[in-house]
């Protein structure tokens, strides 16, 4: 994550800032993980493509009673504050695959870091 700091610059806030904040939160979760994250809860895997923020939110929201990911859920809501239609949403889930929250977070983190490096901030 250290290398991400190189993108920071004085002046107007770059569009990368929201993405960087989300990445930092996911890094915190993975680094501070002692017991199984969210007691090993399982969530739907998602397509890490267009609409992934909404898809990630819809998947993670099914984990209840896990304070470790609540900030992540709220930050994802920043990208996706209003509900997407059922038609849009149905294509975002890989509905035959469930993975542990910890793995979901790691996969999402890797993908977001890749987007950041490539300058795809939206």
């Amino acid at each position: 994550l250290t290398c991400l700091g190189g993108f920071a610059s004085p002046g107007p806030v770059p569009p990368s800032t929201a993405l960087r904040e989300l990445i930092e939160e996911l890094v915190n979760i993975t680094q501070n993980q002692k017991a199984p994250l969210c007691n090993g809860s399982m969530v739907w895997s998602i397509n890490l493509t267009a609409g992934m923020y909404c898809a990630a939110l819809e998947s993670l929201i099914n984990v209840s009673g896990c304070s470790a990911i609540e900030k992540t859920q709220r930050m994802l809501s920043g990208f996706c504050p209003h509900k997407v239609s059922a038609g849009q949403f149905s294509s975002l889930h890989v509905r035959d695959t469930k993975i542990e929250v910890a793995q979901f977070v790691k996969d999402l983190l890797l993908h977001l870091k890749k987007l950041f490096r490539e300058g795809q901030f939206n």
Epitope: T17, E21, I61, M75, L76, G78
Partner: antibody, heavy 118, light 111 residues
């Protein structure tokens, strides 16, 4: 501590324009969606506009085409540009941090009063 | 638009007793099993404050005296026991369908 401070309200004639501002502090402004919610003199609450962290905007039909929500992420300020104002737009306008459709309006400012009258 | 009807419009409750406020939606506000209904408290002269999100989840810092329940079209906010500081107007709000809408409010007073 999350703080939202609205300004820019006042008395305006029907058909006039007004721009509201909301200064935000105490949280990473760019990471959260923001909204404007108004409260009529009859104390009814009405959602007015929302903007995502990426700049996508959402409006009810009642203000679409007349109101524009925007944000300055460098200065942590939310705006609401209002034009073609009507008497029914008279209300207290609140700025709110929107934690999304799953969490609601998590924090509210103290509001700024807009009165539309001839 | 989804219409939210709150009842009663006002109620007076003795200190230490239970207050129950109802919110009925004109159509379901559930999304994949999650109820997109939230509750707010507005004290006199103040701005609204989030109490409950997704029908039954207590927002951080809100006392456990407040609780929410319900699904689809019928929702309830319960305050038990009521304290003097709870004098306020309470609003429900749905975020399942644009435009997001609020109930008309319920004014709570102490008997």
């Amino acid at each position: 501590e999350v703080k939202l401070v609205e300004s820019g309200g006042g008395l305006v004639k029907p058909g006039g324009s007004l721009k509201l501002s909301c200064a935000a502090s105490g949280f990473t402004f760019i990471s959260y969606a923001m909204s404007w919610v108004r409260q009529t003199p009859e104390k009814r609450l009405e959602w007015v506009a929302s903007i995502s962290s990426g700049g996508n905007t959402y409006y009810p039909d009642s203000v679409k085409g007349r109101f524009t929500i925007s944000r300055d992420n460098a200065r942590n300020i939310l705006y609401l540009q209002m034009s073609s104002l009507r008497s029914e737009d008279t209300a207290m306008y609140y700025c709110a941090r929107l934690d999304g459709y799953y969490f609601g309006f998590a924090y509210w400012g103290q509001g700024t009063l807009v009165a539309v009258s001839a | 638009d989804i219409v939210l009807t709150q009842s009663p419009a006002s109620l007076a409750v003795s200190l230490g007793q239970r207050a129950t406020i109802s919110c009925k939606a004109s159509e379901s506000v559930d999304n994949y099993g999650k109820s997109l209904m939230h509750w707010y408290q507005q004290k006199p002269g103040q701005s609204p404050k989030l109490l409950i999100y997704r029908a039954s989840n207590l927002e951080s810092g809100i006392p456990a005296r407040f609780s929410g329940s319900g699904s689809r079209t019928d929702f309830t906010l319960t305050i038990n026991p009521v304290e003097a500081d709870d004098v306020a107007t309470y609003y429900c709000q749905q975020s399942n369908e644009d435009p997001w809408t609020f109930g008309g409010g319920t004014k709570l007073e102490i008997k």
